[in-house]
């Protein structure tokens, strides 16, 4: 049944009285026929535009095959123009038309907002034949109407390639306000104003908006939808919602949490992944970001040596990945390491400090006073040096590495020898005669190989030409090594 029908014009009888015996042929006078005649004014028409149906279109009178009389103009009878009902109610509406029996194969289609309604719609057409005319009633019913059923419905009938269009029946489904825009969660700066938006629609309109903050009404006088609330600033987290009211009742939006941006929590679980003599690879688990994205982090490094001056080295790094290689550290040293990260509000506190150590380093200085002799009788080269003055951090000396390069016409080859830490001399076999031998020595610890000494060259003559004078590295301050032959 039609609920809450409100008509915009008086309805016409479903079946008018008997059709006039003699029909007017003057189309002009037809236009002024009283509506109670059962006919609507005749209008010349063009094809209906989608979405903008012509109202009261009629088929122009035609001459019968016998040519004796004209048929009346055809038009749908006027019916209720506007039906207002609540969501989930049922509605039924119809259009009716009386068609002379000379017309065959009349079909009625239903259209909504310019589109034909096909398929699973509840449309029923009933025919009531009489001597001269057949009354046709096309009914359309919707069960449990929804907002999507709102719109303008019309009937169309095709006769002899002419289209007859009914007046529209406007269906207005009313219900509780429906949100088209709800407030959204935000992270905001403390004591800084921000906006929230709420929009809801009917029908029925108007829709009035109340804002609620932490269950207290912000505006006792509602605003028409849409509404923008300027929140003057918060010092702590708050929950906001908006209430939309119309004549049907109230709908409440989702509650949204507005968080206050704060400095991050300190990182946790600082871990050591790898240590070398001069670097330590660390990782950490970031703390809570304080509702604001991390910008960068700071790795703080203190040397744990009672003799150190206690200064802190600071290394800045990106917030992601949560890993950093600390470089430029002393070998074989103990360090305390902490991490702090920042967002737009500020720096977190430093993580719990952890202890880490670097490993032994390679020596930082080369052996001193390298001297090279040619021992022709034994056909070898005698090499001597002095132990370098290595720092504690370099660790314990495990030996030396000797590099000797032999060069003669177009040929060059390098050989490496390892000798123990107790030695300060070594002998190497002559590889090539009539060639130059270049010797360099480096100290070796568990931490690696130190720098090589400056090269010392000695010429190895052909057999039988002897000179026992040594070649040696110069005393400190001399620019070039001395070569004695």
């Amino acid at each position: 049944a039609i609920t809450e029908a409100r008509e915009e014009a008086k309805p016409y009888p479903l079946f008018p009285g008997p059709l006039p015996g003699s029909l007017q042929t003057d189309h002009t006078s037809l236009l002024s026929l009283p509506h109670t005649s059962g006919y609507q004014p005749a209008l010349m028409f063009s094809p209906t535009q989608p979405g903008r149906p012509y109202t009261g279109n009629v088929a122009i009178p035609r001459v019968t095959s016998a040519g004796s009389k004209l048929l009346p103009p055809l038009a749908f009878k006027h019916t209720v123009g506007h039906i207002i009902l609540s969501e989930h109610k049922d509605v039924k509406f119809n259009c009716s038309i009386s068609v002379p029996n000379i017309y065959q194969d009349t079909t009625i289609s239903w259209w909504k907002d310019g589109k034909e309604l096909l398929g699973a719609h509840h449309a029923i057409t009933q025919f009531y034949p009489d001597d001269e005319v057949t009354a046709i009633i096309a009914s359309f019913s919707i069960t449990s109407v929804q907002r999507s059923d709102n719109g303008s419905y019309i009937c169309k009938m095709k006769i002899n390639n002419e289209e007859i269009v009914s007046d529209p029946i406007y269906i207005e489904v009313q219900g509780l306000p429906h949100f088209t825009k709800q407030p959204e969660s935000m992270n905001v700066t403390r004591n800084t104003a921000f906006n929230l938006t709420c929009q809801a629609v009917g029908p029925p309109e108007p829709v009035n908006i109340f804002w609620v903050q932490n269950s207290s009404r912000v505006n006792e006088q509602p605003e028409k939808s849409p509404s923008v609330l300027t929140v003057p600033g918060l010092t702590e987290m708050a929950v906001f919602s908006c209430e939309a009211h119309n004549d049907k009742g109230l709908t409440v939006s989702k509650g949204v949490q507005i968080n206050i941006k704060a400095i991050p929590s300190p990182p946790t679980e600082v871990s050591i992944h790898n240590s070398t003599a001069h670097s330590i690879l660390i990782s950490w688990v970031p703390g809570f970001d304080g509702y604001s994205p991390f910008r960068n982090c700071s790795v703080q490094v203190k040397e744990v040596d009672p003799l150190s001056n206690g200064s802190v080295m600071i290394f800045n790094t990106s917030a992601s990945p949560h890993m950093y290689q600390i470089k430029q550290l002393q070998a074989l040293a103990n360090y305390s390491i902490g991490v702090s990260c920042m967002n737009e509000i500020g720096w977190s506190a430093v993580s719990p400090w952890i202890l880490a150590s670097t490993t032994e380093g390679a020596p930082s200085v080369a052996p001193l006073n390298v001297t090279v002799f040619l021992n022709e009788s034994r056909d070898n080269v005698d090499i001597r040096w002095m132990k370098p003055l290595t720092k504690r951090q370099a660790g314990e000396l495990v030996g030396y590495r000797i590099s000797h390069v032999w060069q003669s016409a177009g040929i060059s080859k390098e050989l490496l020898e390892e000798v123990g830490q107790n030695n300060s001399r070594a002998q190497i076999s002559v590889q090539v005669h009539n060639a130059t031998c270049t010797v360099r020595i480096a100290a070796v610890t568990k931490g690696g190989v130190g720098p090589f000494s400056d090269p010392v060259k000695i010429f190895i003559p052909a057999h039988g030409w002897v000179d026992h004078a040594p070649s040696s590295t110069p005393a400190p301050g001399n620019a070039d090594p001395v070569l004695i032959i």
Partner: antibody, heavy 118, light 106 residues
């Protein structure tokens, strides 16, 4: 500049009635609620309640239910406070104040002194 | 209803000094507003929503606080600042005013 202009001082006898007006200008009257605040001589401020200028619905605080009536004439952007059965203790300055979000009274009338004395 | 207690009831200071006025609520409120009233005049909004300066109010006035404890501060008193100051809460109906603090010239 937003202005709230109140009617002049009134001297009334106990049992009589008084109607105080508050005319608003330079803003859309029906957009903001109108509050009424009482200040007895030498005392602090008491919120009496407010009227929805769009719907005309009044809201009274507990101490001001009964003899106090808020009303409107939106055609002239004016709010009214009527007090009936006046008592000596109703002697006070009555203020109208524009009522905005978060219960802020951002603009005030100059006040109307109502004196109830026999 | 929420009761607002303002302290001190009277504050005697000299121009140029700093004034700190307190307002304590009987239970937590959302925001506090502050008004200034001079003799024979209507109250005037100074600070709304705890810390926001109302239109036309000099920057020497500031507000702070949350929960139940709120403060109005006048950084450097001018002769025209000597008046009565009221706090008013938002968060629970009915909205209530404090009893006022009278700021007088020492």
């Amino acid at each position: 500049q937003v202005q709230l202009v109140q009617s002049g001082s009134e001297l009334k006898k106990p049992g009589a009635s008084v109607k105080v007006s508050c005319k608003a200008s330079s803003y859309t009257f029906t957009t903001y609620g109108m509050s009424w605040v009482r200040q007895a001589p030498g005392q602090g401020l008491e919120w009496m309640g407010w009227i929805n200028t769009d719907s005309g619905v009044p809201t009274y605080t507990d101490d001001f239910k009964g003899r106090f009536v808020f009303s409107l004439d939106t055609s002239v952007s004016t709010a009214y406070l009527q007090i009936s059965s006046l008592k000596a203790e109703d002697t006070a300055v009555y203020y109208c104040a524009r009522y905005t979000n978060y219960g802020v009274f951002d603009y005030w009338g100059q006040g109307t002194l109502v004196t109830v004395s026999s | 209803e929420i009761v607002l207690t303002q302290s001190p009831a009277t504050l005697s200071l000299s121009p140029g000094e700093r004034a700190t006025l307190s307002c304590r609520a009987s239970s937590s409120v959302g925001y506090m507003h502050w008004y200034q009233q001079k003799p024979g005049q209507a109250p005037r909004l100074l600070i709304y929503a705890t810390s926001n300066l109302a239109s036309g109010i000099p920057a020497r006035f500031s507000g702070s606080g949350s929960g139940t404890d709120f403060t109005l501060t006048i950084s450097r008193l001018e002769p025209e600042d000597f008046a009565v100051y009221y706090c008013q809460q938002w968060g629970s109906l009915p909205f209530t005013f404090g009893g006022g603090t009278k700021l007088e010239i020492k």
